[in-house]
Interface confidence: medium
Amino acid sequence: FKVATPYSLYVCPEGQNVTLTCRLLGPVDKGHDVTFYKTWYRSSRGEVQTCSERRPIRNLTFQDLHLHHGGHQAANTSHDLAQRHGLESASDHHGNFSITMRNLTLLDSGLYCCLVVEIRHHHSEHRVHGAMELQVQTGKDAPSNCVVYPSSSQDSENITAA
């Protein structure tokens, strides 16, 4: 399977909420012994590979934000830790996987990565990730609501399957 990023750039005004989204593409094994570990983190556009560096989102690590569920299940983070930081990650039955960030500040600007690990019986090494940019703006040039820019088909399909 692969991960697609429907939008490569989100431009939002300060104080707004935004939901960043990734989507699982291709055949997803829904066997009873297959589960998925999904998470989000901040990164930088590294020279070697985007998303190789895993930095916290609002002081929460990828570990704090992860979901672990069966291939046929929906899930979301319900723990207080994430919600206290204005964050919630969620996954639906259709392969959509998102993180919602509330009350954006300029400090939230940067590169965000979603990551999916397929776990088979023990732990599979099948990892895929997607990247997108968030720009938080303030002042008279800031949009009134979030503006999203679709990924080109090449960007969307060119996500790594490690």
């Epitope: 570990y37 990828f62 704090d64 992860h66 830790l81 690990v117 023990h122 599979s124 090494e125």
Partner: antibody, heavy 118, light 104 residues
Framework: EVQLVESGGGLVQPGGSLRLSCAAS????????MSWVRQAPGKGLEWVAT????????YYLDSVKGRFTISRDNAKNSLYLQMNSLRAEDTAVYYC???????????WGQGTTVTVSS | EIVLTQSPDFQSVTPKEKVTITCSAT?????MHWYQQKPDQSPKLLIK???ELASGVPSRFSGSGSGTDFTLTINSLEAEDAATYYC???????FGQGTKLEIK
Amino acid sequence: EVQLVESGGGLVQPGGSLRLSCAASGFTFSSYTMSWVRQAPGKGLEWVATISNSGSYTYYLDSVKGRFTISRDNAKNSLYLQMNSLRAEDTAVYYCARDTVLSPFDYWGQGTTVTVSS
Amino acid sequence: EIVLTQSPDFQSVTPKEKVTITCSATSSISYMHWYQQKPDQSPKLLIKDTSELASGVPSRFSGSGSGTDFTLTINSLEAEDAATYYCHQRSSFTFGQGTKLEIK
């Protein structure tokens, strides 16, 4: 500081049972997958079992499946390994290890010794 | 199950020497991880994801490889590096048999 402290090891006869415990501190225990890894005397490392952060998913080494049960109590920051029908080949030091799925076992306890002998 | 075979099983080396430990897998894998275990101590994560040093690990350690062949290298060995080193992969959670490094 991340700390993992195992307890519950000891001498047990073949066919007997033991329950190992691992007390975790210094990190958000409920966010982490946890595992047990063992090391027989003078031998290498062997993974035994893994449990997801919520406890919903468990994974076992084939030779312990049906005999060992991994569990956790997130309210108590504790990991457990219930070992039944013990065999001589289960004799080992048992380590609990933190497991981030993305990274391998990044922190280990000091180990607790299980000896199965008549 | 993927089997990992390390080479050599044992090596006696002098300080400042360069040491190379190899780990060969029976099937192709994406990432290899390495642990160091000193006598009467718990294992310690050394390298994750083939080449990324774990926190606090000296830069004389490095990892490389892909597919079925992976390498742990210690440049300019120090006395404190006397230990057993294990490779590890997560597709079926297996470890190599270990390589014991003795300092002359």
